[in-house]
Amino acid sequence: PKQTLPKPIIRAESTYMVPKEKQATLCCQGSYGAVEYQLHFEGSLFAVERPKPPERINGVKFHIPDMNSRKAGRYSCIYRVGELWSERSDLLDLVVTEMYDTPTLSVHPGPEVTSGEKVTFYCRLDTATSMFLLLKEGRSRDVQRSYGKVQAEFPMGPVTTAHRGSYRCFGSYNNYAWSFPSEPVKLLVTGDIENTSLAPTDPTFPDSWDTCLLTRETGLQKDLALWDHTAQNLLR
């Protein structure tokens, strides 16, 4: 069998949801000594980076300016050390947002509920779309999908204090082109005193792991980088 290097890690810097005309930054974390990194889009070569000097850096950033629906889709990356190529990274879905209109998000029976109550979110968008998405702030990878002509329902079932937080919805024109986000709706779930004090509120920062952990190598950093790579794999 053909020998390959370990697959790199691909990430979107800050977020995978990029407003149209803004810049996306994708990071490909590979290996010290890699002479070339390739970014692939929907199976075709998109861009090439050659780090300088290759032995001193463990990855690269690919900048994608002027985001639009033609650049939204599935990305992956590979790298090369000498003549040997790596396996392909996992796929990363890059989404363009702020397309067309803004949906309206509402919640029933209301934004303040008691633990155990059944809650339903409603996302409405009058322009032609059939798929709707609901995201919780700080949890943008956990996307809920629902379908409807102008409105979709997101039944949450009996809620707990873990459901507390800020929600937004999007209309989707395809898997990778989303509308403007709705105004946020903050869900407040009250429970008994014990539960409330124990339940942590969600972080307000989005997707704290979506950062590019690329390092320049000093003597000490080789071990740190290896530890970091192992830690990231354990987290996934």
Partner: nanobody, 126 residues
């Protein structure tokens, strides 16, 4: 707004050479990644060569060793030196730019490019 104007196309015999030029307007040229694409009659537009803002280059396999891309930031111009031309190189050649770029990426996919020229025709025939 960036405007790109290609020149240097024409008719040449197989084995001959041509140099295409692409003049860019605006002060953003030094921060642009540039590329050349071509479209033969009845075919899809295809990648030919590209150059990053830091002068790294990348070529399509079909032109490697025969074509050379270069840039002159002082003249806001990118060049495509074509030699050992073949009949299959006959096409309209387009210059394209990715503006702005912040790294040293070489862009290969046409979707990456946000500015395009009108094209210049290259015909290779005996």
């Amino acid at each position: 707004e960036v405007q790109l104007v290609e020149s240097g196309g024409g008719e040449v015999q197989p084995g001959g050479s041509l140099r295409l030029s692409c003049a860019a307007s605006g002060r953003t040229f030094a921060s642009a990644a540039m590329g050349w694409f071509r479209q033969a009659p009845g075919k899809e537009r295809e990648f030919v060569a590209a150059i990053s803002r830091s002068d790294d280059t990348y070529y399509a396999e079909s032109v490697k060793g025969r074509f050379t891309i270069s840039r002159d930031n002082a003249k806001n111009t990118v060049y495509l030196q074509m030699s050992s031309l073949r009949a299959e190189d006959t096409a309209v050649y387009y210059c394209a730019a990715v503006v702005p770029t912040y790294g040293s990426s070489i862009y290969v996919h046409s979707a990456a490019y946000n500015y395009w020229g009108q094209g210049t025709l290259v015909t290779v025939k005996p």
